[in-house]
């Protein structure tokens, strides 16, 4: 914003109140400039002279009109698991958010304070509800017919190929082996997605099949950060 | 591009109260006043009051204090004016206006919300 | 609070015609806070001129504006038809901002 223009304090009329981007001044008994976003106040306004404005020093801010005699300085720099995605400058304070694959698990006026890595599903889970920017990964067993043989913060459970002739019966970590004669499916084949805004899609690998350990009923695990809950791994 | 939305067309009864807002697009919503006036039919413009979203200050006129409410949610740019115990003579376009920032000119303006008060 | 009065408070003017409206304040005014908006049927008022004398975006350079202290006024150097609209000035000298009345200009 451009700085304001020059003009004299002046006394409001009785049952009038200052100009907008000017204050009171209960000293001076008068209505003074504000100094604009990028300033503060150097030199307070006196009856016959107005408000001072300075530029704020590297490092500090003003992001409102203001009559503040220092600038705010800015926050700390991003740690590694953050990205800056607002720079310090003398109108803004920095902005850190969490990087892809990671959320944020403790948030500030403005950016994140804390980000932690979000869940992956192991094999025999599937995501139930995606991880967001301020939530983490939640994760569900594969119902019956159902799979998913990766660990991954953004597969879901995949239904098991349909076989004329089974080889192998599925589980809920791996997918049905057939015999030799073409197999239909109950859905296009491949992996299946959810959208993931904050999270890189994870590499598909065929790990040995293992049986699943999750139990029969399907359930939701607890959001938030936590230990790793059955179902999930860590980093 | 600078863009003030206004919210519908309103018709009220008298003594009922309603909320108009107006969602700024397109510059920092903190950093300008924002801006309420009242055009009756054939008639001429007459300020209600401002809100700087950045800190909440508002400033009202006498005559529409204790009948307008300024509000504003940094979260969704938007500024609301809230208006209560309307009567006939409430019975106007609305606009909210943006503050240029420098000579006090009102440099946008939304489309403007009608309100219609009517037994 | 400070009081704007407009005059004429509806004119007519033909095509080419040079055209002045003036706008007249109770108490001094600074040419920086003295305003000019443009409001045709159905639509919402435009900053025109600002500070007295300067254009806002867009607007034709027939129009000027000029004045001080307690008398201004705003100035068409050749009348076209889409002109025609109500012309309001506006003070921010002193709280409150008022507005003049307005001026309705038509084409004869």
């Known amino acids: 914003l451009p700085a304001q223009v020059a003009f004299t304090p002046y006394a409001p009329e009785p049952g009038s109140t200052c100009r907008l981007r000017e204050y009171y001044d209960q000293t001076a008994q008068m209505c003074c400039s504000k100094c604009s976003p990028g300033q503060h106040a150097k030199v307070f306004c006196t009856k016959t002279s107005d408000t001072v404005c300075d530029s704020c020093e590297d490092s500090t801010y003003t992001q409102l009109w203001n009559w503040v005699p220092e600038c705010l300085s800015c926050g700390s720099r991003c740690s590694s698991d953050q990205v800056e995605t607002q720079a310090c400058t003398r109108e803004q304070n920095r902005i850190c958010t969490c990087r892809p694959g990671w959320y944020c698990a403790l948030s500030k006026q403005e950016g994140c304070r804390l980000c932690a890595p979000l869940r992956k599903c192991r094999p025999g889970f599937g995501v139930a509800r995606p991880g967001t920017e301020t939530s983490d990964v939640v994760c569900k067993p594969c119902a019956p017919g159902t799979f998913s043989n990766t660990t991954s913060s953004t597969d879901i459970c995949r239904p098991h190929q349909i076989c004329n002739v089974v080889a192998i019966p599925g589980n809920a970590s791996m997918d049905a082996v057939c015999t030799s004669t073409s197999p239909t499916r109950s859905m296009a084949p491949g992996a299946v997605h959810l959208p993931q805004p904050v999270s890189t899609r994870s590499q598909h690998t065929q790990p040995t099949p293992e049986p699943s350990t999750a139990p029969s009923t399907s359930f939701l695990l607890p959001m938030g950060p936590s230990p790793p809950a059955e179902g999930s791994t860590g980093d | 591009e600078v863009q003030l939305q206004q919210s519908g067309a309103e018709l009220a009864r008298p003594g009922a109260s309603v909320m108009l807002s107006c969602k700024a697009s397109g510059y920092t919503f903190t950093s300008y006043w924002m801006q309420w006036l009242k055009q009756r039919p054939g008639q001429g413009l007459e300020w209600i009051g401002a809100i700087y979203p950045g800190d909440g200050d508002t400033r009202y006129t006498q005559k529409f204090k204790g009948k307008a409410t300024l509000t504003a949610d940094k979260s969704s740019s938007t500024a609301y004016m809230q208006l209560s115990s309307l009567a006939s003579e409430d019975s106007a376009v609305y606009y909210c206006v943006r503050d240029d920032g420098l000579y006090y000119a009102m440099d946008y303006w939304g489309q403007g919300t009608s309100v219609t008060v009517s037994s | 609070q400070i009081v704007l009065t407009q005059s004429p408070t509806i004119m007519s003017a033909s095509l080419g015609e040079r055209v002045t409206m003036t706008c007249t304040a109770s108490?001094?005014?600074?040419?920086?806070?003295l305003h000019w908006y443009q409001q045709k049927p159905g639509s919402s008022p435009k900053l025109w001129i600002y500070s007295t004398s300067n254009l806002a975006s867009g607007v034709p350079a027939r129009f000027s504006g000029s004045g001080s202290g307690t008398s201004y006024s705003l100035t068409i150097s050749s009348m076209e038809a889409e002109d025609a609209a109500t012309y309001y000035c506006h003070q921010y000298h002193r709280s409150p901002p008022t507005f003049g009345g307005g001026t309705k200009l038509e084409i004869k």
């Open positions: 108490s001094s005014v600074s040419s920086s806070y």
